[in-house]
Interface confidence: low
């Protein structure tokens, strides 16, 4: 008799794929535009990325550092009207893209939560949650919560409002902290909270260190649903050595949890991070006309248009990974097991019941390596076969679909492999 199938876990929409942050409408749209009506025109692009949610804004009225002049129920006229927003919600729904609204109050000012009048601000947030839930928003984000006094209790309260309206609504909190204890204390009192932090960017970017960061986090959070990013708002290129960009895309898409990206991550967009100054939003490079004041000769390989036409580009890799992440059970909600690995690399298995299994091998080193994968730590339900088929490599030139011997895997510097193998009873 065939073994009984494992019961499927409850899957919320944010469990099924990546979230995409557009914190700056002007930067994202470029060409001097930057409003909700214009954003509607880019929903097809977001669909092509197979992202499940768009984290938008903040777009509310905020007079810099002025509590009275901050209205979380009003859209800043520079971005458009409530009608424009309703129209965006409707169009996004048709394309199965959920809208998450950033309500970080004082986003134009010095302290995101104002330095005083915490209770007044918290009440404004409560009112805003109720208002925008009625308007059809799918979730909310609040950032810089390390600046919010009694953050845990406020988050619990806001979570109750959100979940009370519908279990299908999401609350994301962002912090600049990379400290695991601080992160855990925020998560402790908030069961379904999705938390973005700088945890992964506090790294020496070796295979060994990354493995220990990931496994510590997963062990500490238990069966709680995680999110994976390198920061609460910035671009991957601001935190990573450039040569590890593809490797991290592969990792973020294949760890158990929701990957969260910022606009431009899919093409390797860069933005200067200047000490002591707010990061100015970079302009999204749609095509060569996005370079308004310099000659853009040879720049196509940096743009969405140029990368869309190149199967070996970062954007093409992003799309392939996002597609796999949203349809394979083992990647959607499978168990995670890290394999024994050397200092240069990190590898793990994702598996769910009798579905196809996935093996991820990441070489963080700047030298090629031969990896003999050790399955010693694996439970019987996740044993390694002798060979697995190569689904994709982060580097061009591999023969995809071909079986690779796991005892004798050779990886190029900074190469990541995604391999698949069947369940065997």
């Amino acid at each position: 008799r065939a073994p009984r199938c494992r019961d499927l876990p409850v899957q919320k929409w944010w469990h099924t794929g990546a979230l995409y942050r557009i914190g700056d409408l002007q930067g994202f749209q470029g060409n001097g535009a930057g409003n909700l009506a214009g954003l509607k025109g880019h929903l097809d692009y977001l669909s092509s990325l197979k992202v499940k949610g768009l984290v938008l804004g903040p777009i509310h009225k905020n007079q810099k550092d002025d509590v009275a002049g901050t209205d979380l129920l009003q859209i800043d006229p520079n971005f458009g009207s409530k009608e424009d927003f309703a129209s965006l919600l409707q169009s996004a729904k048709k394309k199965s893209i959920r809208i998450i609204l950033d309500l970080t109050p004082n986003y134009q000012g010095e302290n995101s939560w104002f330095s005083t009048q915490v209770d007044t601000v918290a009440t404004k947030v409560k009112d805003a949650l109720e208002f925008w839930l009625q308007a059809g928003v799918d979730g909310f984000q609040v950032r810089d919560i390390e600046n919010l006094k009694d953050a845990s209790s406020f988050l619990a309260e806001w979570q109750n409002i959100t979940k009370g309206f519908s279990e299908d609504r999401l609350l994301i909190a962002g912090t600049n902290s990379s400290d695991l204890q601080q992160i855990l204390s925020l998560l402790e009192s908030n069961k379904d909270l999705l938390l973005t932090s700088s945890y992964l960017s506090n790294s020496s970017f070796t295979g060994e260190h990354t493995k220990s960061l990931v496994t510590q986090y997963l062990n500490a959070t238990g069966n709680r649903w995680c999110s994976w990013s390198l920061s609460q708002a910035g671009l991957l290129t601001s935190f990573l050595p450039a040569q590890l960009l593809r490797l991290y895309q592969l990792m973020l898409f294949t760890l158990p949890g929701t990957p969260v990206f910022s606009y431009g991550d899919e093409i390797g967009l860069e933005a200067a991070a200047v000490p002591g100054q707010p990061v100015e939003a970079p302009v999204m490079l749609w095509d060569e006309s996005s370079f308004p004041f310099i000659s853009a000769a040879g720049s196509a390989n940096m743009t969405v248009k140029g990368q869309s036409e190149d199967p070996g580009s970062l954007l093409s890799l992003f799309r392939r990974l996002s597609d796999q992440r949203s349809k394979e059970r083992s990647l959607l909600h499978g168990d995670f097991h890290a394999l024994s690995s050397g200092p240069g690399f990190f590898s793990y298995i994702r598996h769910w019941d009798q579905n196809e299994r996935f093996l991820v091998v990441l070489n963080f080193g700047d030298v090629g390596l031969s990896a003999g994968l050790q399955a010693s730590d694996l439970p019987a339900s996740a044993s390694l076969p002798a060979k697995a088929d190569l689904l994709l490599s982060t580097q061009p030139g591999r023969d995809e679909g071909s079986p690779l011997e796991l005892e004798r895997l050779k990886l190029e510097p900074h190469e990541g492999l995604l391999l698949r193998f069947p369940y065997v009873a």
């Epitope: 050595p241 200067a272 302009v283 996005s290 308004p292 004041f293 310099i294 940096m302």
Partner: nanobody, 125 residues
Framework: QVHLVESGGGLVQAGGSLRLSCAAS????????MGWFRQAPGKEREFVGT????????YYTDSVKGRFTISRDNAKNTVYLEMNSLKPEDTAVYFC??????????????????WGQGTQVTVSS
């Protein structure tokens, strides 16, 4: 404050090569987009090329594409302009510049915050 100093200019025959350096002090430039510009006598300053923060992306004006190469060594806080197959029309004062707000000179805000004093390049026929 960022202080930029160019060096490596000089007199060279047409077809020859030069390597200009731009050494920065006062702050690390690894998070700045860096650009090279030039100004020929009696002409406006013109864009030559730019390099992104990490050095992974470069852009050049059409007239130098394929002949000039910009690179950077963030550990040494220095940016380079390698110039090959030089032509008399490349004669100019060459300036390097730092954009502290952007990783490339590509955003609509544009503009560089810090400039060097320039180094003279003369190409004789």
């Amino acid at each position: 404050q960022v202080h930029l100093v160019e060096s490596g200019g000089g007199l060279v025959q047409a077809g020859g090569s030069l390597r200009l350096s731009c050494a920065a002090s006062g702050r690390t430039i690894s998070t700045y987009g860096m650009g090279w510009f030039r100004q020929a006598p009696g002409k406006e300053r013109e864009f030559v090329g730019t390099i992104s923060c990490s050095g992974t992306s470069t852009y050049y004006t059409d007239s130098v594409k394929g002949r000039f190469t910009i690179s950077r060594d963030n550990a040494k806080n220095t940016v380079y302009l390698e110039m090959n197959s030089l032509k008399p029309e490349d004669t100019a004062v060459y300036f390097c510049a730092a954009d502290t707000r952007h990783c490339m000179g590509y955003t609509k805000h544009g503009g560089y915050d810090y400039w060097g004093q320039g180094t003279q390049v003369t190409v004789s026929s």
